[in-house]
């Protein structure tokens, strides 16, 4: 087989992806309130509801239309601490529900791991990959018929998610960055981007960018625990701001934006 | 209702050239991969090459790859299969399917067929 | 490349009577999300292909009840609880694992 463009690494999809069992409950982040006063806003707010409501992660994603606009960078990060996994060799996890910042703003992607031997320090490593659909045309119009279906899907499969699991070979696949030690190298396409790896493995952006949406897998590789779920992903999202933001976004404050 | 139509098929000669068009209507084109499937007369179905909503990715059958070029314009609702250096195996109904969770194709045009013959 | 090979490649079957097509591949379909990339596809005489089950086991928007898809790993099959006439055709099982490959095809005909 042939592929072209960036779409490289693994061709059999998401990999590890959630590191949740399928049968698992879904864990929800919280809803939204709407505020509004004008349809605008209530637009908005529907589409925020689309992305977090309910099992499916459907709803907002990078788009040509967004690139117009103001953004704010929503983070949703589908592994949270209150999925609790069994003990295995090795364990990562996201943990934050979703995280808010304006474009070219600061934003982390939480990533802790945990091994059962640690004579070696592991490898960490933190992927993008761009979405198998595009979330904001769906998040924009939640009635649709392509809606219905992503419903009735997560319905029957709870935790599967159409935007995140596809073969990379339809997909853009990059290294963002990996840590060994204190030595964090950046992937290729990120060099010069002030990015790193802080902490246990988070990922920090001190300036987020239009084409970072999309779903950063972390995943720790040791020598010593072979076994366990060491991958879990994050999905970022940018998304053009409106009028409705404070609304869209309960107890958000928008600050300035910087060129 | 959801729906793809293909054209541009039809008869040619070994070593030239032909593009087929999807026309998709009904749902938010620019939100899922697509894909090209053909069937030769009297045989099974060989998936072709399939794009990425936003054109970026690309992925061909090695029977096709080099010789075959899948694209999409968003603006227009339509996919593209450009088919050079055509040989009579090529021959059979093209359809062109959208790209569905879990990687199926859930919705199919009625086909177009390319007669490779000189 | 994933191979997939079904059986039988002709399926007589009897209005009312169960019928069930397999489809076996050369490596395991199971992804480590815990999903079989395994699809059916009908196709009618004369007519495109129509999704039938995805993901192993989920019936598509529309289908029949009667369809039903199981299986894990290599094996999978798909059955048809009580086969009426309008299910005659082609049945096409296809992995969606690496790339996308088709098995041959089973002919379904009323005896």
């Known amino acids: 087989m042939q592929q072209d463009g960036l779409g490289v690494g693994t061709r059999n999809g998401s990999g590890k992806g959630r590191s949740v069992h399928p049968s698992w409950p879904w864990c929800a982040p919280r809803p939204l309130r709407y505020f509004g006063r004008d349809a605008r806003a209530r637009r908005a707010q529907t589409a925020a509801m689309a992305l977090l409501a309910g099992g499916l992660s459907r709803g907002l994603g990078s788009h040509p239309a967004a690139a117009g606009r103001d953004a704010v960078v929503f983070v949703w990060l589908l592994l949270s601490t209150w999925c609790t996994a069994p003990a295995r060799a090795i364990q990562v996890t996201v943990s934050n529900p979703y995280h808010v910042v304006i474009l070219f703003q600061p934003v982390t992607l939480p990533c802790t791991y945990q091994m059962t031997s640690t004579p070696t320090q592991p490898i960490v490593i933190w992927k993008y990959k761009s979405f198998c659909r595009d979330r904001i045309a769906d998040a924009f119009s939640p009635a649709s018929v392509d809606n219905q279906l992503n419903a009735q899907l997560a319905a029957g499969n709870p935790g599967y998610n159409p935007y995140v699991e596809c073969q990379d070979s339809v997909r853009t696949v990059r290294v963002v960055a990996t840590k060994q030690g204190n030595a964090v190298t950046l992937g290729d396409y990120y060099q010069g981007r002030r990015i790193t790896i802080t902490g246990n493995a988070d990922l920090t952006f001190d300036q987020t960018a239009w084409g970072d949406s999309g779903v950063y897998y972390c995943s720790v590789v040791s020598a010593q625990d072979l076994q366990g779920n060491n991958e879990a992903y994050a999905e970022l999202i940018v998304l053009g701001r409106t009028s409705g933001v404070a609304e869209l976004l309960p107890g958000f404050q928008a600050g300035p934006i910087e060129d | 209702q959801v729906q793809l139509v293909e054209s541009g098929g039809g008869v040619v000669q070994p070593g030239r050239s032909l593009r087929l068009s999807c026309a998709a209507s009904?749902?938010?084109?620019?939100?899922?991969?697509m894909h090209w499937v053909r069937q030769a007369p009297g045989k099974g179905l060989e998936w072709v090459a399939v794009?990425?909503?936003?054109?970026?990715?690309?992925y061909y059958a090695d029977s096709v790859k080099g010789r075959f070029t899948i694209s999409r314009d968003n603006s227009k609702n339509t996919l593209y299969l450009q088919m050079n250096s055509l040989r009579a195996e090529d021959t059979a109904v093209y359809y062109c399917?959208?790209?569905?969770?879990?990687?199926?194709?859930?919705?199919w045009g009625q086909g177009t067929m390319v007669t490779v013959s000189s | 490349d994933v191979v997939m090979t079904q059986s039988p490649l002709s399926l007589p079957v009897t209005p009312g009577e169960p019928a069930s097509v397999s489809c076996k591949s050369s490596?395991?379909?199971?992804?480590?999300?815990?999903?079989?990339?395994l699809d059916w596809y009908l196709q009618k005489p004369g007519q495109s292909p129509q999704l039938l089950i995805y993901?192993?086991?989920n019936r598509a928007s529309g289908v029949p009840d009667r369809f039903s898809g199981s299986g894990s790993g290599t094996d999978f099959t798909l059955k048809i609880s009580r086969v009426e006439a309008e299910d005659v055709g082609v049945y096409y099982c296809?992995?969606?694992?690496?790339?996308?490959?088709f098995g041959q095809g089973t002919k379904v005909d009323i005896k």
């Open positions: 399917a959208r790209d569905s969770p879990g990687n199926a194709f859930d919705i």
């Open positions: 009904g749902f938010t084109f620019s939100s899922y991969a």
């Open positions: 794009i990425s909503y936003d054109g970026s990715n690309k």
């Open positions: 490596q395991s379909l199971l992804r480590s999300n815990g999903y079989n990339y």
């Open positions: 993901l192993g086991s």
């Open positions: 296809m992995q969606a694992l690496e790339s996308w490959t």
